[in-house]
């Protein structure tokens, strides 16, 4: 399955959008930051099948997605930027799921992959469990936005990496 | 290789300004904020201030500000550290280095090779 | 702002030593805590950060410990590259500070 050019487009718009949500000064949140053991071994790219890293990347999305739509999020960040932002996210998790559907025909995706899932799952859940503890407030957020810019640029990367490999 | 390249030594005399330039490369350069500290001749190290090329937003130490000013073109992957009228106690080796903002990764990782500035009449 | 005291300011050791340096800060900074290497007309070079994890490529002989006000850097064995000026400094909040420096000299 070959993502199309304007996937690797929407994944660019995503993290300028990403970048202008920022509503307050970052200075002010250094204290505010967070280890969120973001799983950075399901992101090189090395030990995985093309399908195993379309499902991750899947579900990266995914769960970007889930937590750019609750009310909390709706509540922090400019409603119209929010929109297009979510927009390109549906549109990567479309362009995924397509190729998802193809490679698993392709390839049976091991068990190892459900592990990976996991993991990104977990972190997703730190993330939230993060916000809630912080009362979702605006120095968490900008630590989220930052934490999410920095996961979506991992993925980006695994992106790359699958297209050199066709 | 992730590398951040400063301009070279200058000697100005006083009331003189001055703007000094760090540039990185090897990453994605609106991704990190750059911080500037200062090392007087036999002294120890002092921050003076930040800045996020994303925006140019900017923080500077109490001791600094108002008598530095900080900035970045992230077009060409730069951020500058100026002054408008220099004093014989700027003299000084200026540093910038690379700062995670918000994420958890480490501090300062990498610096430049600093910028002797010597200010003499 | 927070105030970074390290101790002592110098100290004389021989290659082989362990060498222990201590920085305190004047309010909690929880693990927000970095250690630098300086050598003379070198830029400081990161050693630990979040007050112990060591920074890729540093020899394992380094080592950070503490969290709250109290933090230590240990060198296990000292070697003859070592000698040098450690600076710890605070990355809590803004203005960061460093503490004013501990200079490692051959006895």
């Known amino acids: 399955c070959d993502l199309p050019q304007t996937h690797s487009l929407g994944n660019r718009r995503a993290l300028i959008l990403l970048a202008q949500m920022g509503r307050i000064s970052h200075f002010s949140c250094l204290k505010d930051r967070h280890d969120f053991g973001f799983p950075e071994e399901e992101f090189d790219g090395h030990q995985f099948q093309k399908a195993q890293a379309i499902s991750v990347l899947h579900e990266m999305i995914q769960q970007t997605f889930n937590l750019f739509s609750t009310e909390d999020s709706s509540a922090a960040w400019e409603q119209s930027l929010l929109e297009k932002f979510s927009t390109e996210l549906y549109q990567q998790l479309n362009d995924l799921e397509a190729c998802v559907i193809q490679e698993v025909g392709v390839e049976e995706t091991p068990l190892m992959n459900e592990d990976s899932i996991l993991a990104v799952r977990k972190y997703f859940q730190r993330i939230t469990l993060y916000l809630t503890e912080k009362k979702y407030s605006p120095c968490a957020w900008e630590v989220v936005r930052a934490e999410i810019m920095r996961s979506l640029s991992f993925s980006t990367n695994l992106q790359k990496r699958l297209r050199r490999k066709d | 290789e992730v590398q951040l390249v400063q301009s070279g030594a200058e000697v100005k005399k006083p009331g003189e300004s001055l703007k000094i330039s760090c540039k990185g490369s090897?990453?994605?350069?609106?991704?990190?904020?750059i911080g500037w500290v200062r090392q007087m001749p036999g002294k120890g190290l002092e921050w003076m201030g930040i800045?996020?090329?994303?925006?140019?937003?900017?923080a500077y130490s109490p001791s600094f500000q108002g008598q530095v000013t900080i900035s970045a073109d992230k077009s060409i992957s730069t951020a500058y550290l100026q002054w408008s009228s220099l004093k014989a106690s700027d003299t000084a080796m200026y540093y910038c280095?690379?700062?995670?903002?918000?994420?958890?990764?480490?501090?300062?990782?990498?610096w430049g090779q600093g910028t002797l500035v010597t200010v003499s009449s | 702002d927070i105030q970074m005291t390290q101790s002592p300011s110098s100290l004389s050791a021989s290659v082989g030593d362990r060498v222990t340096i201590t920085c305190r800060a004047s309010?909690?900074?929880?693990?927000?805590l970095n250690w630098y290497q300086q050598k003379p007309g070198k830029a400081p070079k990161l050693l630990i950060y979040?007050?112990?994890s060591l920074q890729s490529g540093v020899p394992s002989r380094f080592s950070g410990s503490g969290s709250g006000t109290d933090f230590t850097l240990t060198i296990s064995s000292l070697q003859p590259e070592d000698f040098a000026t450690y600076y710890c400094?605070?990355?809590?909040?803004?203005?960061?500070?460093f503490g004013q420096g501990t200079k490692v000299e051959i006895k």
């Open positions: 280095a690379r700062h995670p903002g918000l994420n958890w990764a480490p501090d300062f990782d990498y």
């Open positions: 090897g990453y994605s350069f609106t991704s990190y904020w």
């Open positions: 800045i996020d090329p994303s925006d140019s937003d900017t």
């Open positions: 309010q909690s900074i929880t693990n927000f």
């Open positions: 979040f007050a112990s």
């Open positions: 400094q605070q990355s809590l909040d803004f203005p960061l500070t």
